[in-house]
């Protein structure tokens, strides 16, 4: 089983970053950390999408990774996609320092995110509380600013 993974986020223009993943035990939480730069100040949706396909850039990554066929939510919600990691927050310099611990994603098994695409979005994720249909699918996070396929790391 892989215990570490990494993702290089690449986008149109200034948005780019590197995100690391570590899971010490197969059923344990995954630590997610790294940095994304070139963002506008504020909250940006942060999700694992289903496909590790970047043929058309971030467009071809498909919907949020959702093997349990649930509605979109926040990372602390029972009702959420596996890929729902909430928001990252960019400071006034456009840098988001990411530090997340999540117990739903995994680096092995049915919830494995390796080979899928990590996406940072244009707008804040409303965590499924937006009151419209789009909120229950995407959190109204808007377009995909940067993305990368999550790969095994040493």
């Amino acid at each position: 089983m892989a215990t570490k993974a990494v993702c290089v986020l690449k986008g149109d223009g200034p948005v780019q970053g590197i995100i690391n993943f570590e899971q010490k035990e197969s059923n344990g939480p995954v630590k997610v950390w790294g940095s994304i730069k070139g963002l506008t100040e504020g909250l940006h949706g942060f999700h694992v999408h289903e496909f590790g396909d970047n043929t058309a850039g971030c467009t071809s990554a498909g919907p949020h990774f959702n093997p349990l066929s649930r509605k979109h939510g926040g990372p602390k919600d029972e009702e959420r996609h596996v890929g729902d990691l909430g928001n990252v927050t960019a400071d006034k310099d456009g840098v988001a320092d990411v530090s997340i611990e999540d117990s739903v994603i995994s680096l092995s098994g049915d919830h494995c995110i390796i080979g899928r695409t990590l996406v940072v979005h244009e707008k804040a994720d409303d965590l499924g509380k937006g009151g419209n249909e789009e909120s229950t699918k995407t959190g109204n996070a808007g377009s995909r600013l940067a993305c990368g396929v999550i790969g095994i790391a040493q």
Epitope: K10, G11, D12, G13, V15, F51, G52, D53, N54, T55, A56, G57, C58, T59, S60, G62, P63, S143, R144, L145, A146, V149
Partner: antibody, heavy 119, light 110 residues
């Protein structure tokens, strides 16, 4: 100047091969997925193939799978399409393109190059 | 056959409003953004609408896009003779892992 310059088209017999090239300039080529789109005479546009910025993801239309190969050289800022076992129905103007997408607001198309497959 | 369905032709007189439809499925229009291109004879396509309803700078506000469910439409108001062209809708298809185009609509200004 931001542009895509295409070369490599021409007349070829069925079953033969041809390689198209598309040289990019004026923008960070290695930031973008790139594509080939074709248009048969008097017909509509058809996506042929696409390749991610780092060649990690590649896709083809069913009509060309197994015969065409897309590749890129980010040092030379060039996109390629190797076309083997060409058929009469492959006759078209081939465009290389940075297509509009989630993160591409300003697309860019090459001028197109005509490939004619005929005996 | 094209995955996205457009009427082959549309027409209108100068000053009129014309709408071009584009019908798809849940794996393309239903899941992803729609783009509209204009193609004048002998030239490469030009982007008119991105992300369903956004206009790139330089495209007049006479052009507007909308999307509902698995269908999209392009509206052109204040029709002009230089709007005579072919119009294509495009979307990424998650099932096919491909960009899919409509068959194109030839717009004639009478």
């Amino acid at each position: 100047e931001v542009q895509l310059v295409q070369s490599g088209g021409g007349l070829v017999q069925p079953g033969r091969s041809l390689r198209l090239s598309c040289a990019a300039s004026g923008f960070p080529f290695d930031d973008y997925a790139m594509h080939w789109v074709r248009q048969a005479p008097g017909k509509g546009l058809e996506w042929v193939s696409g390749i991610s910025w780092n060649s990690g993801s590649i896709g083809y239309a069913d009509s060309v799978k197994g015969r065409f190969t897309i590749s890129r050289d980010n040092v030379k800022n060039t996109l390629y399409l190797q076309m083997n076992n060409l058929r009469v129905e492959d006759t078209a103007v081939y465009y290389c393109a940075k297509l509009a997408g989630d993160i591409v607001v300003i697309p860019l198309w090459g001028p197109g190059t005509l490939v004619t497959v005929s005996s | 056959l094209p995955v996205l369905t457009q009427p082959p032709s549309a027409s209108g007189t100068p000053g009129q409003r014309v709408t071009i439809s584009c019908s798809g499925s849940s794996s393309n229009i239903g899941s992803n953004y729609v783009y509209w291109y204009q193609q004048l004879p002998g030239t490469a396509p030009k982007l008119l609408i991105f992300r369903n309803n956004q206009r790139p700078s330089g495209v007049p506000d006479r052009f507007s896009g909308s999307k509902s469910g698995t269908s999209a439409s392009l509206a052109i108001s204040g029709l002009r003779s230089d709007d005579e062209a072919d119009y294509y809708c495009v979307a990424w298809d998650d099932s096919l892992s491909a960009w899919v185009f409509g068959g194109g609509t030839k717009l004639t200004v009478l």
